[in-house]
Interface confidence: medium
Amino acid sequence: EINGSANYEMFIFHNGGVQILCKYPDIVQQFKMQLLKGGQILCDLTKTKGSGNTVSIKSLKFCHSQLSNNSVSFFLYNLDHSHANYYFCNLSIFDPPPFKVTLTGGYLHIYESQLCCQLK
């Protein structure tokens, strides 16, 4: 396993929520992506391929997510100051080999302007 800081913008803010972008190589066909807040698993998504190249997407800890051919986006809503923390994308690659695990992280700063329900 390797841990590191993301060299891309992981956090995209909109409408009082945040999209957390977890990237993976476009060559990857089967993987598990977990979103961690500190050491706690918030969300996960697993993509596998069966016979006949049928794709299966499963989540044990479901969050609103969006899958593309090179990223998984997890969406957190109703932001408040308690959301400020280190977030990590925990990627396990099953195919193509070799099996790899990598933790890519960044700190989510919460500013007043990004909160969903500001007091006027």
Epitope: S5, N7, P96, K100, T104
Partner: antibody, heavy 127, light 112 residues
Framework: QVQLVESGGGLVKPGGSLRLSCAAS????????MSWIRQAPGKGLEWVSY????????YYADSVKGRFTISRDNAKNSLYLQINSLRAEDTAVYYC????????????????????WGQGTTVTVSS | DIVMTQSPLSLPVTPGEPASISCRSS???????????LDWYLQKPGQSPQLLIY???NRASGVPDRFSGSGSGTDFTLKISRVEAEDVGVYYC?????????FGQGTKVEIK
């Protein structure tokens, strides 16, 4: 589909210059290290240079150091090789190729081989 | 620089028969992460090189399973279990452990 297309080659006199370009499509160009590899007529492959996804890390083969400059424009999905002070031994087909996947700061951890190559552009150095 | 040495340099083959190419490196290609940073490429006549095997033994996408890579450290082998006519071309090994990347001299595979 994933594709790399080189251009900019041609016939140039010794001491002259050229700028090679490589247009990438079908993948997130800004996530990958990119390489230039060349092949002299009837010879084997020779690695020339590579550049990290952000352009902050660059390496050159000793044979081209100080004469060649690799660069990239992620907004244009393009890779470049500026070649100066050309010599007869620089005559070759120049290929651009996709290298390390790079999303971790200072750690080209994801390596699946040099898995995408362009068709090549020919540089001929002759007086 | 790491020197890569291939043998043989020329390999006449019979379709349907197995074939084997050796690649030796002047230094170990085994990274601390446990992977051997050794690739195999095939350049068919008039074409760009194409990736066959990466990290010593992993077949690239779309590569037929008659191709296999093995070895560790400094000694590596590319095997073709049953050669087909379309397998002719020049095979190169390349080390990706250190810069500069270095290639073997190439092995020309041709039909007998």
């Amino acid at each position: 589909q994933v594709q790399l297309v080189e251009s900019g080659g041609g016939l140039v006199k010794p001491g002259g210059s050229l700028r090679l370009s490589c247009a990438a499509s079908g993948f997130t160009f800004s996530d990958y290290y990119m390489s230039w590899i060349r092949q002299a007529p009837g010879k084997g492959l020779e690695w020339v240079s590579y550049i990290s996804s952000s352009g902050s890390t660059i390496y050159y083969a000793d044979s081209v150091k100080g004469r060649f400059t690799i660069s990239r424009d992620n907004a244009k999905n393009s890779l470049y090789l500026q070649i100066n002070s050309l010599r007869a031994e620089d005559t070759a087909v120049y290929y651009c190729a996709r290298d390390f996947y790079d999303i971790l700061t200072d750690s080209p951890y994801f390596y699946y081989g040099v898995d995408v190559w362009g068709q090549g552009t020919t540089v001929t150095v002759s007086s | 620089d790491i020197v890569m040495t291939q043998s043989p340099l020329s390999l006449p083959v019979t379709p349907g028969e197995p074939a084997s190419i050796s690649c030796r490196s002047s230094q170990s290609l085994l990274h601390s992460n446990g992977y051997n940073y050794l690739d195999w490429y095939l350049q068919k006549p008039g074409q760009s090189p194409q990736l066959l095997i990466y990290l010593g033994s992993n077949r690239a996408s779309g590569v037929p399973d008659r191709f296999s890579g093995s070895g560790s450290g400094t000694d590596f082998t590319l095997k073709i279990s049953r050669v087909e006519a379309e397998d002719v071309g020049v095979y190169y090994c390349m080390q990706a452990l250190q810069t500069p990347r270095t290639f073997g001299q190439g092995t020309k595979v041709e039909i007998k």
